[in-house]
Each structure stands twice: as C-alpha cells, then as structure tokens.
C-alpha cells in the first residue's frame, strides 16, 4: 500500500488524495475517529467513495495485514443474507455472526465480524484511483 501524500510524485504510485492509501487501482481511507455504520457510510459517500466492499480473498488478506485488532466498518449488511452495499453477496469469506440483532459488518486483522450498527467503530472507504 502506498500513501498518496508520500508518493505523489512516484510514477509507480499514481496519487490518491492526502491520507488515502493506494493499492492496485483503488484508494483506501482508514479512519482514525469512530462513527456508527450509517455515519461511516455517509462519510465515504460525501468523498465520492463507498464504505469498503471487498472483491476477493486477496484484497481481504492485504487489507487485514494493514489492520490492527480494532474493528473497522465495511459496506456489508445483513438484509436477508449478508450483502455488500452494491447488492452482491458475500461469497469468498464467512462472517462471524452471533445474533440476529447484529446486522452490520466490520473487519479487523483476523476476521469479518457482525456487529450492531449503532456501535462506534473506525471505518474504511474505497474508491477508484484517479
């Protein structure tokens, strides 16, 4: 992962906005502050991005290497099955879900985990790089 502010002049790392990280064709924002799930979603949307939707195991593994034990909201919700915000199903990983009242998804270095959506967590935004 490249940080835009550090590598903005590097040809191999086309710039992402300040405080965003580059991986492949995408920019990622890892928040420091905490919000509930819907506020995290709104934060990302306001910056022309979306709450993290992970496409495959490789991307998930790379992001987990970057994360700590702290959970971060991702764009995953249980609406009659776990689905990403674009409507696609979660199919490359399992989510640890203990209760029906936990309907939003979060990720840390170890797992995808269901949580009640009101919990304040850090979050990850993702958008296509310029």
């Amino acid at each position: 992962l490249c940080q835009g502010s550090k590598y903005s002049t590097c040809a191999s790392c086309p710039s992402c906005p300040d405080h965003w990280m580059k991986y492949g064709n995408h920019c990622y924002y890892f928040s420091v502050e905490k919000k509930d799930w819907i506020s995290s979603l709104e934060f990302c949307l306001a910056r022309d991005s979306h709450l993290l939707m992970i496409t495959d195991k490789q991307e998930m593994s790379l992001l987990q290497d970057f994360l700590s034990e702290a959970f971060h909201w991702v764009g995953l919700r249980n609406n009659s099955g776990w689905r990403w915000e674009d409507g696609s199903p979660l199919n490359f990983s399992r989510i640890y879900s203990n209760s029906l009242v936990q309907t939003c998804g979060a990720i840390n270095k170890n797992s995808l985990q269901a949580s009640s959506c009101e919990v304040s967590l850090q979050w990850v935004c993702k958008k296509v790089s310029p």
Epitope: V101, Q102, A106, Q113, E118, V119
Partner: antibody, heavy 125, light 112 residues
C-alpha cells in the same frame, strides 16, 4: 446453538454470600460485542437487572446493589460468576443469566437474546 | 429510574382474536443516538423469558409474524394479530435507553 445454564446452592442463610455460575455454549465471551448479564425475579414479581460483563471484562452493576455484587468471567471455561454478599430473605428469587448484545453503550441499550432456565435461590435461616 | 407501566395487567383473550398490550415509560426512551431501545419479552409458564421484539418493532429470530411492535417516545404497543394457545404467558416490556435498564411489571395473557 446458544445455550446458558445457571447453577447455585438453592438455599442460602441470611448474611451469607451467594455464588452463582452461568455456563454457556454456542458463543465466545472473547468475541467483540458479546456480554453476559444477570437478572432476577422474586416470586410473583417483575424482572430486575443486576449486572453484566462485556467481552473485554468491562463490568456494570445495578447501583443500589453495587456494593454487594461482583461479576467475573472465565472465557476459557465459558463461565460467568456472580457473587452477592450479605444475603437477605428479600433476595429470594429465581436468578437468570442471559447473553447480552452490545449496541454501543457499555451501561445500557442491549438485547438479552438468549436466557438460561434460571436457578431458584431461597434465603432462609 | 425510568418507570415502565404496562396495561392491562391481565388480558383474557379468545383464541383467534387479536390482543394488544400497552407499555408507557415515565420519560422518553429515545436515546441520544436517535434509536429507541424498547424490547418485549415473553415468559411462558415455568420458563425463562425470551426475546420477541427489539428496538420497538424488530421481530427476533423465530418469532411468528403475528407479533408486531410499534410506538415512539413514551408510548409503545405489542400486538398479536390472532392469539394462539402457545402465546399464553407474561409479557414484559424493557427499556435499555437509560441507566438503569428497567422492566415493566408484566401483562399476563390467558385464554378465555
């Protein structure tokens, strides 16, 4: 499948200390967002929350009983223990443990989504 | 402490007929985050309570759709569209928005 079961002495003498154990399965109390609480119900009366403990060992008590209560957990044994000192006949009740789900506040707003069958405690000399 | 007042305390119902239980809180139980943490529990005879409804109107897993919850602020209602024999028991409302969390005194539903 989530299950919880309470165990205790059944009969306690006044001024003695009550020790109750909640043994659970189907979830881990090390998992983010999980907790276990204790609720009691005196005969023919309503439910009363006593205490709960979260996955990270954060503990909360009913204020009026705080000086008498201690809650602890052993995540490896899947157990939560509640002790209540200086028992009195008015503490005669059925004591339940329940799993509680974190909604963002340590002290309140949670769901008790699974309950144990309860254990009856009688305080009498 | 927030007082949760349920009515009626006893509710005789003919099977197949609807039933409605009221729960009023002594002050608003809308949390500062905008959510209302009002739940309904059913305690069948000789059993422990079980969660029916959470956050005012959400049915918990396995709860039949004849059960519905509604309300806001301080006034809440549990409705059963068609009462069945297995619905007999004591229904408790519970508020988790403010410390200490509190239960109502219960409404005993029985068959006529």
């Amino acid at each position: 499948q989530v299950t919880l079961k309470e165990s205790g002495p059944g009969l306690v003498k006044p001024t003695q200390t009550l020790t109750l154990t909640c043994t659970f399965s189907g979830f881990s109390l090390s998992t983010f967002g999980m907790g276990v609480g204790w609720i009691r119900q005196p005969p023919g009366k309503a439910l009363e929350w006593l205490a709960h403990i979260w996955w990270d060992d954060d503990k909360w008590y009913e204020l009026a009983l705080k000086s008498r209560l201690t809650i602890s957990k052993d995540s490896s044994k899947n157990q939560v223990v509640l002790t209540m000192t200086n028992m009195d006949p008015v503490d005669t009740a059925t004591y339940y443990c329940a799993r509680v789900i974190y909604y963002g506040s340590r002290s309140a707003y949670y769901s008790m989504d699974y309950w144990g069958p309860g254990t009856t405690v009688t305080v009498s000399s | 402490d927030i007082l949760m007042t349920q009515s009626p305390l006893s509710l005789p119902v003919t099977p197949g007929e609807p039933a409605s239980i009221s729960c009023k809180s002594s002050q608003s139980i809308v949390h500062s985050n905008g959510h209302t943490y009002l739940e309904w529990y059913l305690q069948k005879p000789g059993q422990s309570p079980r969660l029916l409804i959470y956050k005012v109107s959400n049915r918990f897993s396995g709860v039949p759709d004849r059960f519905s919850g509604s309300g806001s602020g301080t006034d809440f209602t549990l409705k059963i569209s068609r009462v069945e024999a297995e619905d007999v028991g004591v229904y408790y409302c519970f508020q988790g928005s403010h410390v200490p969390v509190t239960f109502g005194a219960g409404t005993k539903l029985e068959l006529k």
